[in-house]
Interface confidence: low
């Protein structure tokens, strides 16, 4: 999906209002210095591409982020403010669709969410610059 035509201001507002709080809640009990940020992004569409990938694509050691509250909010926000984004989600797997209780948070998932926080901060910062 090409995030170029998203309403970035609206996405920023939703992030600051709600998504950020859920990310921080997920990370509660860990220090920001516990993980090194290895994922970055260069502009707003690129940041959203990386955010979507880290949030919704399962990895071998962290398969369940898509069911978290911050992920559901991210999906709703992208679907609202990125034209046509909803259509790209129609073939999402059953596992992505279902809501299940979170199992024990693995260190790898905490690391991935730490990367997400970094990407979102980068996204906010790029809003201050001319694209």
């Amino acid at each position: 999906y090409d995030f170029t035509n998203c309403d970035f201001q609206k996405i920023e507002a939703d992030y600051l209002r709600t998504i950020s709080k859920d990310l921080i809640t997920y990370m509660s009990g860990t220090k920001s210095t516990d993980f090194n940020n290895t994922v970055s992004c260069s502009n707003r569409p690129h940041c959203l591409t990386e955010i979507q990938s880290l949030t919704f694509n399962p990895t071998p050691r962290c398969a369940s982020l898509a069911k978290e509250m911050f992920a559901r909010k991210t999906k709703a926000t992208l679907a609202l403010w990125c034209p046509g984004y909803s259509e790209t989600q129609i073939n999402a797997t059953q596992a992505m669709k279902k809501r299940r209780k979170r199992k024990v948070t693995t260190n790898k998932c905490l690391e991935q969410v730490s990367q997400l926080l970094g990407l979102w901060r980068r996204f906010i910062r790029t809003l201050l610059k001319k694209q």
Epitope: T18, M69, L80, I90, K97
Partner: antibody, heavy 122, light 108 residues
């Protein structure tokens, strides 16, 4: 307890306007998406419109698009539906319903009002 | 636009199991919600997200969803279960909420 109460229904002539209201109580109104759903006499449920929790997004069924406007006042815990250019086929019981904002874009409707009857007839 | 198809009526003997179906193209990829509506009353949510149940709904009500059919199952049917039942999804391609036509459940 959590409650939604609709008002404003009545009999109106075709082409005229009517404004429905829905008063919410017992829950934090400003954090929920809100919908209008209608049911013509003896017929099934038909979704009408949605408004995002903070009013920044609205969407309408094709059958009412351009004629109906959904609004909300979070300071007063009220939802409104302004219905213009009414037609006979708009005759129905109108329900307001809430949906958890973030579960998906349009989640299940977990609380409904009792409905208000709108009759469009000359 | 997306269409949900329900049988107009289903009958069940007291104590037996009733199954109400909701058909739609690849409905298994969507979250399906079910409502019960008794005459003169507002609808009540009985199953959401295919198979989850609100706290106020008895365990006799359950749901499933795969392929092109979602099913609401009511076990040990009672006279009080007589009502119209509606399935509902969100059609993401049109951003519209869609209801099935409704099924009248009769407990014989």
């Amino acid at each position: 307890q959590m409650q939604l109460v609709e008002s404003g229904g009545g009999v109106v002539q075709p082409g005229r306007s009517l404004r429905l209201s829905c008063a919410a109580s017992g829950f934090t109104f400003r954090t929920y998406g809100m919908h209008w759903v209608r049911q013509a006499p003896g017929k099934g449920l038909e979704w009408v419109a949605v408004i995002w929790y903070d009013g920044t997004y609205t969407h309408y069924a094709d059958s009412v698009k351009g004629r109906f406007t959904i609004t909300r006042d979070n300071s007063k815990n009220t939802l409104n539906l302004q219905m213009n250019s009414l037609r006979a086929e708009d005759t129905a019981v109108y329900y307001c319903a809430r949906s958890p904002q973030w579960e998906s874009i349009f989640e299940a409707f977990d609380i409904w009002g009792q409905g208000t009857m709108v009759t469009v007839s000359s | 636009s997306y269409v949900l198809t329900q049988p107009p009526s289903v009958s069940v003997a007291p104590g037996q199991t009733a199954r109400i179906t909701c058909g739609g193209n690849n409905i298994g990829s969507k979250s399906v919600h079910w409502y019960q509506q008794k005459p003169g009353q507002a609808p009540v949510l009985v199953v959401y997200d295919d198979s989850d149940r609100p706290s106020w709904i008895p365990e006799r009500f359950s749901g499933s969803n795969s392929g092109n059919t979602a099913t609401l199952t009511i076990s040990r049917g009672e006279a009080g279960d007589e009502a119209d039942y509606y399935c509902q999804v969100w059609d993401s391609s049109s951003s519209l909420v869609v209801f099935g036509g409704g099924t009248k459940l009769t407990v014989l």
